[in-house]
Interface confidence: medium
């Protein structure tokens, strides 16, 4: 049986339930990997309270419609004269980015995730060359998600003291250049989410291959590399690469513009305030 | 104030049965999650049952399909039904309570099996 959503394929997804301090390991083409889940779980359930682990959702035992993904295990359930077995049920909707799964609510015998994502979309109007994970969720189960800075069309101008070049990015996505003809940008390779600008010529300095990463408190980074093997020849025989660094500010003010702190052989380091990079709870307070 | 009561604890025999029950007071039982754990003599405290929020239960192997975990909103109580009791299920149980405000341990009551 094909992939339903081959765009959501690559990467195992997380979902949490906040209020029984449970974290979900989802990977809807094939296992995630996870040896206590056993070999073929689709769905893994980690109890971080009581550190153990349960499939609620087998890959092989998957079905599918166009909006529907149901994994099905072999675990009974404790449902009254009964025969139902332990599943998981995953509604998609459309959506302007890969999105993220959203943990519902469960039953004894059914958990319940909801996944607004490009990849359920009818028409590919919003659907990227390239797109990765955007979100991450640290210890304590706090959500950081910066699937608001994804653009859907056109970029972000890097904050550069170089007057000759420019240095365009998007997050967690290659750049839509079709749907925004600016100039600068129109030159831009396909597949690109680092478009650096040297008067009329456009290079790809880097796409985005891993999901966003956590790595300390309230600072998430984006690594994004030039997958294509040809060398820049400005870049003295090194292969470019774009590391962005999210901060959540340390008090609430307004967000800065992405600015780059470290340039060399066309390695960029960038470094980007935003409360986007603050956990959920904080941003809804 | 959170307080967490367990009661029916006892002695009994290899193969016997015992219902633990935990009545709370200051929380709203069916909005959250329950854990019932144990410690033997001389041993780490270890999990034994869990009854999520919407209803969903996992048990420890050392328990499955001889203990079952129940909840009665309406008498704001948790219950622990103990089957096929063996000796080395001797051990202080504790009903535990997590909530986002924070989580509450009962003073734990003593389950002995012996002949």
């Known amino acids: 049986q094909a992939a339903p959503f081959p765009e959501l394929c690559s990467y195992t997804w997380e979902a949490v339930d906040t209020k029984n301090n449970v974290l979900y390991k989802i990977n809807i083409c094939g296992s995630v990997d996870i040896v206590q889940c056993g070999p073929s779980s689709a769905v893994c359930m980690h109890d971080l309270k009581t550190r153990t682990y349960h499939s609620v959702g087998d890959s092989v035992l998957r079905s599918a419609t166009r909006s529907l993904l149901e994994f099905n295990t072999t675990v009974s359930c404790d449902q009254q004269g009964t025969n139902h077995r332990v599943q998981s049920s995953i509604a998609f909707l459309c959506g302007k980015t890969l999105g993220t799964p959203e943990f519902v609510t469960a039953t004894e015998c059914v958990h319940y995730f909801e996944w607004r994502t490009t990849a359920a979309c009818k028409k590919d109007i919003f659907k990227a060359n390239k797109e990765v994970p955007c979100y991450v969720f640290d210890e304590e189960l706090r959500k950081h998600d910066l699937n608001p800075l994804i653009k859907l069309s056109g970029a972000y101008l890097v904050d550069d003291s170089d007057p000759d070049t420019s240095l365009f990015i998007n997050v967690c996505r290659d750049i839509d250049t079709l749907r925004d003809p600016g100039s600068q940008l129109r030159a831009c390779p396909p597949g690109t989410a680092a478009c650096l600008v040297r008067g009329h010529q456009a290079f790809d300095v880097g796409q985005p291959r891993d999901g966003l990463k956590l790595v300390r408190k309230d600072r998430l980074v984006l690594s994004y590399v030039r997958e294509e093997a040809g060398k820049l020849d400005f870049c003295d025989g090194h292969s470019p690469a774009v590391t962005i660094t999210f901060v959540c500010p340390s008090e609430r003010r307004e967000g800065t513009i992405p600015k780059l702190t470290a340039k060399s052989n066309c390695r960029y380091e960038i470094e980007w305030i935003t409360e986007y990079a603050c956990h959920r709870d904080y941003l809804e307070s | 104030q959170v307080q967490l009561q367990e009661s029916g604890g006892g002695l009994v025999q290899p193969g016997g049965s015992l219902r633990l029950s935990c009545a709370a007071s200051?929380?709203?039982?069916?909005?959250?999650?329950m854990d019932w754990y144990r410690q033997a003599p001389g041993k780490q405290r270890e999990w034994v049952a869990t009854l999520a929020s919407y209803g969903w239960k996992t048990y420890a192997d050392s328990v499955k399909d001889r203990f079952t975990i129940s909840r009665d909103n309406a008498k704001n109580t948790v219950n622990l039904y103990m089957n096929s009791l063996q000796p080395e299920d001797t051990a202080v149980v504790h009903h535990h309570y997590y909530c986002?405000?924070?989580?509450?341990w009962g003073q734990g009551t003593q389950v002995t099996v012996s002949s």
């Open positions: 986002n405000s924070g989580q509450y």
């Open positions: 200051g929380i709203i039982f069916s909005d959250n999650r």
